[in-house]
Interface confidence: medium
């Protein structure tokens, strides 16, 4: 009996032990994915979306009708701003229409205030037109209000109510948008 | 100038596989990301996925298990592996790319059909 008791007793002692052990992992990745926030936040919600499958927009991603939208919460120039929406199988917000520019504005004025967000949009650097970056022109109520003095490349942003332009290299928030999923039901 | 050439379009069944390439020239191409779209009769040019300088891919949801996005740099070479392909996805597939400067570039396209 007593032999019995003390081998509970040490079979409780490892499990404590391993508990411990996975405490302590957690932390250690809890720390590392404070660091990198985003990424954790789209692999959690990609385990949780494939577990689950229901919610047209991933975690943390605002819906519009048939889009979803990510408002990054770190700066980077135009190019790895792309880059950081193609990770997210996304790509940088592509403005079709008045309406869809509303929303992104009214959006932006609750989550951030006035801050400054690139989009997809770039100046093509031999013919000088606006592109979005899957290679269509933007509608002409969509155009930069103000073209940048900046001999560099030029790329669009977003900032309060407006669409305009700066050299690609400065360092701004950025805007992701993909299709929301489909409700399979 | 940056120039992509996207090769091995072609006619396919439901529930087969096609590899498609996109040779670039004229780039460093290991420093810029490299997407694939696709653009079906009438429709948007959408994305499908894409692979960033640092190698991290990502894809659309209804690619994704799927297709596979992947890099040889030292061939200037960006490859879009399709599997279990579906009457869906026939479109033509384009590969693109943005430079750090923020300028876009394109290839002509490649015709990918899947049909019985």
């Known amino acids: 009996k007593l032999l019995q008791v003390s081998t509970i007793a040490m079979q409780q002692q490892e499990k404590l032990i391993q508990q411990e052990r996975a405490l302590l992992n957690f932390t250690e990745w809890k720390r590392s994915c404070a660091l990198q926030m985003k990424y954790c936040q789209a692999f959690m919600q990609n385990s949780l979306s494939s577990a689950h499958n229901s919610s047209p927009c991933p975690n943390n991603w605002i819906q519009n009708r048939e889009s979803c939208y990510y408002v990054s919460e770190i700066w980077s120039i135009w190019h790895t701003s792309q880059e950081n929406c193609l990770k997210e199988g996304s790509t940088l917000l592509q403005i079709e229409s008045k309406e869809e520019m509303d929303f992104i504005t009214g959006s932006l004025r609750k989550i951030k205030g006035s801050y400054d967000y690139w989009v997809g949009l770039s100046q093509d650097g031999h013919s000088g037109r606006w592109l979005w970056q899957d290679g269509s022109s933007p509608s002409p109520g969509l155009l930069p209000a103000e073209r940048s003095q900046s001999a560099n490349q030029v790329c669009g942003y977003v900032k309060s109510n407006s669409l305009l332009s700066s050299n690609c290299s400065t360092w701004k928030y950025f805007i992701c948008e993909k299709y929301a999923l489909r409700s399979s039901v | 100038q940056v120039q992509l050439q996207e090769s091995g379009g072609g006619l396919v069944q439901p529930g087969g596989s096609l590899r498609l390439s996109c040779a670039a020239s004229?780039?460093?191409?290991?420093?810029?990301?490299m997407a694939w779209y696709r653009q079906a009769p009438g429709g948007q040019r959408e994305l499908v996925g894409g692979?960033?300088?640092?190698?991290?891919?990502g894809y659309a949801d209804s690619v994704k298990g799927r297709f596979t996005v992947s890099r040889d740099n030292a061939k200037n070479t960006v490859y879009l592996q399709m599997n279990r392909l579906k009457p869906e996805d026939t479109a033509v597939y384009y590969c693109?790319?943005?430079?750090?400067?923020?300028?876009?570039?394109w290839g002509q396209g490649t015709q990918v059909t899947v049909s019985s």
């Open positions: 004229g780039t460093s191409f290991s420093i810029n990301g």
């Open positions: 693109g790319t943005s430079t750090p400067r923020g300028d876009s570039y």
């Open positions: 692979i960033t300088s640092d190698g991290s891919t």
